[in-house]
Amino acid sequence: GCLTQLYENAFFRGGDVASMYTPNAQYCQMRCTFHPRCLLFSFLPASSINDMEKRFGCFLKDSVTGTLPKVHRTGAVSGHSLKQCGHQISACHRDIYKGVDMRGVNFNVSKVSSVEECQKRCTSNIRCQFFSYATQTFHKAEYRNNCLLKYSPGGTPTAIKVLSNVESGFSLKPCALSEIGCHMNIFQHLAFSDVDVARVLTPDAFVCRTICTYHPNCLFFTFYTNVWKIESQRNVCLLKTSESGTPSSSTPQENTISGYSLLTCKRTLPEPCHSKIYPGVDFGGEELNVTFVKGVNVCQETCTKMIRCQFFTYSLLPEDCKEEKCKCFLRLSMDGSPTRIAYGTQGSSGYSLRLCNTGDNSVCTTKTSTRIVGGTNSSWGEWPWQVSLQVKLTAQRHLCGGSLIGHQWVLTAAHCFDGLPLQDVWRIYSGILNLSDITKDTPFSQIKEIIIHQNYKVSEGNHDIALIKLQAPLNYTEFQKPICLPSKGDTSTIYTNCWVTGWGFSKEKGEIQNILQKVNIPLVTNEECQKRYQDYKITQRMVCAGYKEGGKDACKGDSGGPLVCKHNGMWRLVGITSWGEGCARREQPGVYTKVAEYMDWILEKTQSSDGKAQMQSPA
């Protein structure tokens, strides 16, 4: 299953399959997730080691048993791959690292006014993988405001150095934020020239294209079909690159298929997995296990659940079957692709779905109307769980926020439905940033069921929580995916990086905002909060957040929206925007429903009709 916990001051011994430099443990974990054999990783921050060569070292590891012995190492961080973790699987990494220079091949230098602009340039350059920016206070005047676009053979820095007044980060192309755009078409009977960066075996051109998309240096590809004239080259997928970023030439060639990486697509990237089943095909590789199962789909599920399994063959040979069950061969290889593909067999083959980010149909957990005052504009995909709850009567308007917590579930505030309990009038918009982008053609979800907490009473602040079951499940994308819920009764975690988001008023007597706003707000103890609200009871099922001096807060129209906190690289839904005295007033924090206190209720209500919990715990 999915394991998300990080082990601090611990280092996994042995099992090394690859090593690289990464700026933090989260990026190291992402590289482990996308490496075909990596199950575990260990990361050495700069502070953890004197050896300059090993600073920022990211060590990817495999283990037949799924675990390795941990040794104590001060400052080291270790953890698991996020294979099998559904919507948490993403190659998108937005963080900017201050005081760090990520080294690589510098292929472009320009002057820009901010690190954000530098990141945007990298995202809009086809070859840029990461960048470094020298700030206005950099010690050498001639380098100030320099934006260096970089690449490397493996897509990760060739070295990482601590350097004052330098900021570094990665391209946001894997976040589907590139302005370049992509070529979706496949070109038959055409072979591209240029440099081969890798060679793998694939059953078709679409698998070849997905592998190209997630390979750090592949810009385009040529695939040789199973009827290609040279038998030894059949099913070969050549991943390619060029100086210009496009093929310098193409040659008409029977039974070849060429195309482009989809990494530069805007708003949608292919899933990093291959779901198709190939009848009459055997995939060869290292044998992991053989099991008897009923049907090829069960074989694929078995492979997906066995974390080391990369691909499978389900044999229908009479000698491989008994009664209704046949042999399911679970296999793996060094590069994640079959070592041999045979056609015209009595088998069916396919790949593990362990990297599919749709995951299962679950919500994610870990082991007084109140908009954002004093906030700033959000960017695409920054808060992919944020939804807008809108009511359509004669006109249509935004009323509340909400948080996507599963394919078919939204968590919001109960008071959003005061006086409007009719599910037919509500429209739920997900995966949006600007309310003005909503037109009559914009898809929306309708409500199947509104579940208001049984102890909620109108015009009282207690138990201000409600679940919405959508009529149809939503697909997960970089712009629309769920927020993880906290553990039940989570009281020990100290959250220091918390944000509130919404389209609500930007001042007390304001109006709904067009662009989703965000504001970083510190949590306030319940004792402190109670002092500020002497006429109200602040219960342990509430959480407060705000600045003593005011100025930043949620406001009208933000109700039901998320208060999220980042802990160990993972965002969790800590609160639901509920109420407050005015907006952003001095010494009047915002009050939020404490989600951890309602985990039993959420779990109970999100049970599927067959009684199976629709929750999964990554821990």
């Epitope: 079909t225 009827v227 779901s275 056609y343 015209g344």
Partner: antibody, heavy 122, light 107 residues
Framework: EVQLLESGGGLVQPGGSLRLSCAAS????????MYWVRQAPGKGLEWVSS????????LYADSVKGRFTISRDNSKNTLYLQMNSLRAEDTAVYYC???????????????WGQGTLVTVSS | DIQMTQSPSSVSASVGDRVTITCRAS??????LAWYQQKPGKAPKLLIY???GLQSGVPSRFSGSGSGTDFTLTISSLQPEDFATYYC?????????FGGGTRVEIK
């Protein structure tokens, strides 16, 4: 120019047999998986059967399994569908279709014939 | 078997309108989806393959999007020759299955 031309349809009694043919031209027939798809009068499309380029592997819809046989003759650029034990519910226009890519069961159909009508009635 | 459900079953529109047809798969099919256009008495014609690949010769007013279970065919500006029935089809696994069709007719 790619062309697919079906023939062999007609009126047949329940329990009877028919053999449909599809003559292909304008592409390298032996490189492509081929398909039969049918459409009952006023209804939607239904995949019937597929055959890989070499002819060495075939697939059938459950509704025709054991009664229909797909085959091909790459030297004649022709696809066949032998239909036995025909039933009233087999009444439809039968189309032959070519795979969009020269691959093993790609599953998308880029060229279709004009169709041949098979009527099963007593 | 994977069921494909199209909606609406029919839509009335005028020349120049933007038309959106949706297709839902009963289980995830990744990007293994095609869209076809069929006119009365004619064979279907491939418009879009692999969710968003535009088939050669098809006008750019046709576009496809989606992944997993939910897919959309959009005709950005309806032309007189676009009045027809549209089918989606999954190619993730056999049996290959089609949606029930959406008839686009003149308002």
């Amino acid at each position: 120019e790619v062309q697919l031309l079906e023939s062999g349809g007609g009126l047949v009694q329940p329990g009877g047999s028919l053999r449909l043919s599809c003559a292909a031209s304008g592409f390298t027939f032996s490189d492509y998986t081929m398909y039969w798809v049918r459409q009952a009068p006023g209804k939607g499309l239904e995949w019937v059967s597929s055959i890989v380029p070499s002819g060495g592997h075939t697939l059938y819809a459950d509704s025709v399994k054991g009664r229909f046989t797909i085959s091909r003759d790459n030297s004649k650029n022709t696809l066949y569908l032998q239909m036995n034990s025909l039933r009233a519910e087999d009444t439809a226009v039968y189309y032959c279709a070519k795979d969009h890519l020269s691959s093993w069961y790609g599953g998308f159909f880029d060229y279709w014939g004009q169709g041949t009508l098979v009527t099963v009635s007593s | 078997d994977i069921q494909m459900t199209q909606s609406p079953s029919s839509v009335s529109a005028s020349v120049g309108d933007r038309v959106t047809i949706t297709c839902r798969a009963s289980q995830g099919i990744s990007s293994w989806l095609a869209w076809y256009q069929q006119k009365p008495g004619k064979a279907p014609k491939l418009l879009i393959y692999a969710t968003s690949g535009l088939q050669s010769g098809v006008p750019s007013r046709f576009s496809g999007s989606g992944s997993g279970t939910d897919f959309t065919l959009t005709i950005s500006s309806l032309q007189p020759e676009d009045f027809a029935t549209y089918y989606c089809q999954q190619a993730k696994s056999f049996p290959l299955t089609f949606g029930g069709g959406t008839r686009v007719e003149i308002k």
